[in-house]
């Protein structure tokens, strides 16, 4: 007998799913942009806001060139369940002030979590590590007040952006080496 | 169209060794993770172990850790399996897989019998 | 003893719609983690029938729809055929062995 019938090719293949998580990585941070911006809009910020239970900023300017593979993806997915984590709480329990704002969360929310499955699927290609995220999951309690659910809104938000931000550049650097 | 052609089944008695071999065409290889993949006769599927797509990464399945290595050479498109210390259970057909597993291989079986 | 748990049999008569469970834990399905689906035809090897959870690899037909909600996800088959017959896995990563696990498979009869 000759050789065994082949495969037909799936639809994607690693390369094609680092495009595709590039692109839903532009249009997340894009739709995070815009939604920021109807933030300050709609409730002015007075300075920078922060929340103890988001993950720290993964890169800077400066680690960029040392980027590997394994560690960008493994890192980007723990942030990004952390965010999506933060934007889910954020819908359940924002209060009536961020209720005007639920279409766009939503939205938000989809986005994410579809980035995150291309970005599983794109470590499961490449047969990398996907280990469950390290440190507790920080149960989120309920916002002290309107103003604090705005507060951490602004904080969740801004954050996100930055990640992002840092995952495009990243993982357009990492396209080159794979 | 996608080929990977396993090779190197066959009998070989309880305690003993086989290498098996895999020849992948029609993709990338050097892009995709890479798994070897068992079902014994009338059974499941049993994953045995997996090598990510630049060898930097190996792992394997408890029952076969310490005995079974798992690697790949990029320059050849041609992933390998070393069994050591055989025992009657991991009698099966051995498919060597890449990706999700998106594409599967026809499958080397191995016997282990006195 | 499979860490994703399938029906071990499903039938149905050909143009009905037949479903397969796969129920896994809080620390694979339940946990961002994908599930993809494989067909296994009588003495052929696997080939993948659905991956990351709905999505359908070029040249499988529609009849083919997968889903996950929690920590389970099944796979649908729509206007049964004979050439349907075939064993059916689901499989997801599993965190804690670093690579995929199977679900012990089911046994899809046409009648």
């Known amino acids: 007998p000759g050789p065994p019938a082949g495969s037909p090719r799936v639809s994607s293949d690693p390369r094609a799913d680092l495009d595709s998580a590039v692109l839903l990585t532009r249009s997340l941070l894009a739709d995070t942009r815009q939604l920021a911006a109807q933030m300050r809009d709609k409730f002015p910020a007075d300075g920078d806001h922060s929340l103890d239970s988001l993950p720290t900023l993964a890169m800077s300017a400066g680690t960029l060139g040392s980027l590997q593979l394994p560690g960008v993806l493994t890192r980007l997915r723990v942030d990004l369940m952390s965010y999506l984590r933060h934007v889910q709480w954020l819908r359940r329990a924002g209060g009536p002030s961020l209720k005007t704002l639920e279409p766009e969360l939503g939205a938000l929310q989809a986005r994410l979590e579809r980035l995150l499955r291309r970005l599983q699927l794109l470590m499961s290609r490449l047969a990398l590590p996907q280990a469950a995220p390290d440190q507790p999951v920080i149960p989120l309690g309920p916002p002290a007040s309107a103003w604090g659910s705005i507060r951490a809104a602004h904080a969740i938000l801004g954050g996100l952006h930055l990640t992002l931000d840092w995952a495009v550049r990243g993982l357009l650097l990492l396209k080159t080496r794979l | 169209e996608v080929q990977l052609l396993e090779s190197g089944g066959g009998l070989v008695q309880p305690g003993g060794s086989l290498r098996l071999s895999c020849a992948a065409s029609?993709?990338?290889?050097?892009?995709?993770?890479m798994h070897w993949v068992r079902q014994a006769p009338g059974k499941g599927l049993e994953w045995v172990a997996v090598?990510?797509?630049?060898?930097?990464?190996?792992y394997y399945a408890d029952s076969v850790k310490g005995r079974f290595t798992i690697s790949r050479d990029n320059s050849k498109n041609t992933l390998y399996l070393q069994m050591n210390s055989l025992r009657a259970e991991d009698t099966a057909v051995y498919y060597c897989?890449?990706?999700?597993?998106?594409?599967w291989g026809q499958g080397t079986l191995v016997t282990v019998s006195s | 003893q499979s860490v994703l748990t399938q029906p071990p049999s499903a039938s149905g008569t050909p143009g009905q719609r037949v479903t397969i469970s796969c129920s896994g834990s809080?620390?694979?399905?339940?946990?961002?983690?994908?599930v993809h689906w494989y067909q296994q035809l009588p003495g052929t090897a696997p080939k993948l029938l659905i991956y990351?959870?709905?999505e359908r690899p070029s040249g499988v037909p529609d009849r083919f729809s997968g889903s996950k909600s929690g920590t389970s996800a099944s796979l649908a088959i729509s206007g049964l055929r004979s050439e349907d017959e075939a064993d059916y896995y689901c499989?997801?990563?599993?965190?804690?062995?670093?690579?995929?696990?199977f679900g012990g498979g089911t046994k899809l009869t046409v009648l």
């Open positions: 897989a890449a990706g999700v597993p998106d594409y």
């Open positions: 029609g993709f990338t290889f050097s892009s995709y993770g």
């Open positions: 090598i990510s797509y630049d060898g930097s990464y190996k």
């Open positions: 809080s620390s694979n399905i339940g946990s961002y983690y994908d």
């Open positions: 990351s959870n709905e």
């Open positions: 499989a997801a990563w599993d965190p804690s062995l670093y690579g995929p696990v």
